[in-house]
């Protein structure tokens, strides 16, 4: 069935590319395993960024070359996405998958538009 | 930009077939599922079919189960959506829709048909081409 998914509108990342956001879903029912994933959204290309499935009450655990980590406290995810270039800025979607036990839930966010601003490079000095 | 533009409707006699097109245009289908819906006068739009490219997995309301086949030519980028025995109740205008599966359920076949004839999942819409079934 459909689940209410909850994300902020717009992130700045920090100078140094990182940006984080929590994305909170209403979990309609007791889920045990549940699955984030983040996408990115741009016109009509959407790609998946990082992806974890967790044990409720553990941690998240994305794959070694992620760019994502995140922590879980109830029914909310704190993600954080590394190594952010300009480039980069666009509208990530948080999506929530309730797995096991049954019945199966999906959640789509509106969507973090994250903005990333490459640093100046230092001026030489003398 | 993306655009969906469907075709092949009209006046058809109880009993009958029809072939909708959806022609799309702006992206390729072959990440996309298509979803054909449809809305009555005085009703809500309902979902009728859907075919995931990526895979070709198809799904149908219970309504039009054994009459209704879509199928896709991603050669063509379109989706059509054939009708046969036709009867009255299924007059109505008739939209195709897309999203990117990546916001459908993971695993196919999860939540069984619901996600992917929910109108909600769907981010972009055609017009809607007529149907009128009636002798």
């Known amino acids: 069935k459909a689940m209410h998914v909850a994300q902020p509108a717009v992130v700045l990342a920090s100078s140094r590319g990182i940006a984080s956001f929590v994305c909170e879903y209403a979990s309609p029912g007791k889920a045990t395993e549940v699955r984030v994933t983040v996408l990115r959204q741009a016109d009509s290309q959407v790609t998946e960024v990082c992806a974890a499935t967790y044990m409720m009450g553990n941690e998240l655990t994305f794959l070694d070359d992620s760019i994502c980590t995140g922590t879980s406290s109830g029914n909310q995810v704190n993600l954080t996405i590394q190594g952010l270039r300009a480039m980069d800025t666009g509208l990530y979607i948080c999506k929530v998958e309730l797995m096991y036990p049954p019945p199966y839930y999906l959640g789509i966010g509106n969507g973090t538009q994250i903005y990333v601003i490459d640093p100046e490079p230092c001026p030489d000095s003398d | 930009e993306v655009q969906l533009v469907e075709s092949g409707g009209g006046l058809v006699q109880p009993g009958g077939s029809l072939r909708l097109s959806c022609a799309a245009s702006?992206?390729?289908?072959?990440?996309?599922?298509i979803g054909w819906f449809r809305q009555a006068p005085g009703k809500e739009r309902e979902g009728v079919s859907c075919?995931?490219?990526?895979?070709?997995?198809?799904y149908y309301a219970d309504s039009v189960k054994s009459r209704f086949t879509i199928s896709r030519d991603n050669a063509k980028n379109t989706v059509y959506l054939h009708m046969n025995s036709l009867k009255p109740e299924d007059t109505a205008v008739y939209y195709c829709?897309?999203?990117?599966?990546?916001?459908?359920?993971?695993?196919?076949?999860?939540?069984?048909?619901?996600?992917?004839?929910?109108?909600?999942?769907?981010?972009?819409w055609g017009q809607g081409t007529q149907v009128t079934v009636s002798s």
């Open positions: 075919i995931v490219s990526s895979d070709g997995s198809t």
């Open positions: 702006g992206f390729t289908l072959d990440y996309y599922a």
């Open positions: 829709a897309a999203v990117h599966g990546l916001k459908l359920p993971t695993l196919r076949g999860l939540g069984g048909s619901y996600y992917y004839l929910q109108a909600r999942s769907y981010d972009y």
